[in-house]
């Protein structure tokens, strides 16, 4: 959480999660009747999300400040973090209930289990993140955030198994960014592109964020990035003030997040 380019930024807010995504009409927000919302989802090979599906998505970081139709004529929106302008200071599904007038105009929440999606919030002790479609080439115009949150006191050991992104000198086209924090505002570690395997990274605290972005042109093979938990007692966690040792980058301790 924080300011970036003068905007309050919060990258835990995923645009798609657990097959659920938000859609609005081409003309903008709150233009779809129930029948039209249903049609929007069906044209994309999906269907209107159920309340349960929307809640499951919200639990892993799906947050949209726009009311939309769900299955069975229900309207609502998912709030991960309460704010003054959205959700009346509450978290959860802000539920407008089943609407009697299906000609009311809202947005749509669609569910498509086959949608190619990426990112999420992860609390598992270990996991492998893959670029969308890996081992096939990733698509243009991708933005993915992986947020890792382990138990307090634990740290994260990140290693790159495969890595092949479009190369350009400043990594301005396609890149992976690593942040030693729970957002993409604080704790910038590095930006990576090309086909050389970056060195391992060990976090200072129990949280880390990976961001993947691809532009509108050339694509490449993609990546696999693995993380494992480093427990407080383990040997490598004692070396946190060392800049690099072997093929590992240890980050100087700064903060942990509960």
């Amino acid at each position: 959480w924080g300011f970036k380019n003068g905007i309050f930024h919060n990258s835990i807010w995923l645009e798609q999660a657990a097959g659920v995504y938000h859609r609005e009409a081409r003309a903008g927000r709150y233009k779809l009747t129930y029948a039209e919302a249903k049609a929007v989802c069906e044209f994309e090979g999906g269907r209107l999300a159920t309340y349960k599906q929307l809640e499951a998505a919200r639990k892993i970081g799906f947050h949209v400040c726009a009311a939309g139709w769900m299955a069975k004529g229900r309207v609502g929106y998912p709030i991960v973090k309460p704010g003054p302008n959205c959700g009346f200071g509450k978290t959860g599904i802000i539920d407008y209930g089943i609407r009697l007038n299906r000609s009311e105009r809202w947005d749509a929440y669609c569910y498509n289990p086959h949608a190619k999606e990426c990112g999420g919030v992860f609390t598992d002790p270990k996991r492998i993140f893959k670029s969308p479609g890996f081992p096939n080439e990733y698509d243009d115009n991708q933005v993915c955030y992986w947020h890792i949150r382990l138990k307090y006191g634990q740290r994260i050991h990140l290693s790159f198994l495969d890595f092949d992104l479009e190369h350009d000198p400043g990594c301005l086209a396609d890149y992976v960014e690593i942040y030693d924090s729970y957002d993409d505002v604080h704790g910038f570690v590095g930006r990576y592109c090309g086909d050389e395997l970056p060195e391992d990274i060990i976090s200072t605290g129990n949280v880390m964020t990976l961001k993947f972005l691809s532009d509108a042109s050339v694509t490449a093979g993609g990546f696999q990035i693995k993380y494992v938990t480093v427990d407080p007692a383990s040997k490598s966690s004692q070396a946190k003030n060392t800049s690099t040792t072997g093929n590992k980058k240890f980050l100087p301790g700064r903060f942990s997040h509960l």
């Epitope: 859609r23 009409a25 081409r26 003309a27 233009k31 779809l32 039209e36 049609a39 929007v40 069906e42 044209f43 994309e44 090979g45 086959h114 949608a115 190619k116 698509d139 243009d140 115009n141 509108a216 042109s217």
Partner: antibody, heavy 120, light 106 residues
């Protein structure tokens, strides 16, 4: 500028299959949808179906579901339509047309058309 | 299926005359779009979202309507307007075209 370049005229026998292609240029192929439209001689326009190149999802009009198979190759920015079990009624001009992914849809650019003649 | 009925099927107009053609839909749509097709060429987007003129379309063309009833109007007919005009709805599956209005020069 946006261009949809369609493959050349085809002559096929009844019962055969044919593959028509539509190469897109001048825009990001995966950001838009590609539709196919049929026009028989001196007749109106008939929507066949569409493909979403980013996901590969496609859907055809019920009338064409056993006739047309739509594909998209992102590496070459090409959409294709295979027509199978050809009959004389399949003789027509076939157009590819691009639409925005925003609802409701309309076609802002069209290919020049491919003429298919089915004849024994 | 949302059937679009265009009328008239064929019409002729003198240069300078006002021309109106209509399109009615069996199911309500939020927008109607119109295409112009001249003989042996691809259709061209002419009017989209009911009333917005596509790039390069002369200002004498206009579109209006809502729900089930839409129209295309030419305020002053010109020779270059001779073509067939198709209405199109992109709101409901399957997407559908009208049968067309053929506009001729009197």
């Amino acid at each position: 500028q946006v261009q949809l370049q369609q493959s050349g005229a085809e002559l096929a026998k009844p019962g055969a299959s044919v593959r028509l292609s539509c190469q897109a240029s001048g825009y990001t192929f995966t950001t838009y949808w590609m539709h196919w439209v049929k026009q028989r001689p001196r007749q109106g326009l008939e929507w066949i179906g569409y493909i979403i190149p980013s996901s590969g999802y496609s859907k055809c009009h019920q009338k064409f579901k056993d006739k047309a198979t739509l594909t998209a190759d992102k590496s070459s920015n090409t959409a294709s339509m295979q027509l199978s079990s050809l009959t004389y009624e399949d003789s027509a001009v076939y157009y590819c047309a691009r639409s925005t992914s925003g609802y409701p849809y309309y076609f802002d650019y069209w290919g020049q058309g491919t003429t298919l003649t089915v004849s024994s | 299926e949302n059937v679009l009925t265009q009328s008239p099927a064929i019409m002729s107009a003198s240069p300078g005359e006002k021309v109106t053609m209509t399109c009615s839909a069996t199911s309500s749509v939020s927008y109607m779009h119109w295409y112009q097709q001249k003989s042996s060429t691809s259709p061209k987007l002419w009017i989209y979202d009911t009333s917005k003129l596509a790039s390069g379309v002369p200002g004498r063309f206009s579109g209006s309507g809502s729900g089930n009833s839409y129209s295309l109007t030419i305020s002053s007919m010109e020779a270059e307007d001779v073509a067939t005009y198709y209405c199109f709805q992109g709101s409901w599956y399957p997407l559908t075209f009208g049968a067309g209005t053929k506009l001729e020069l009197k």
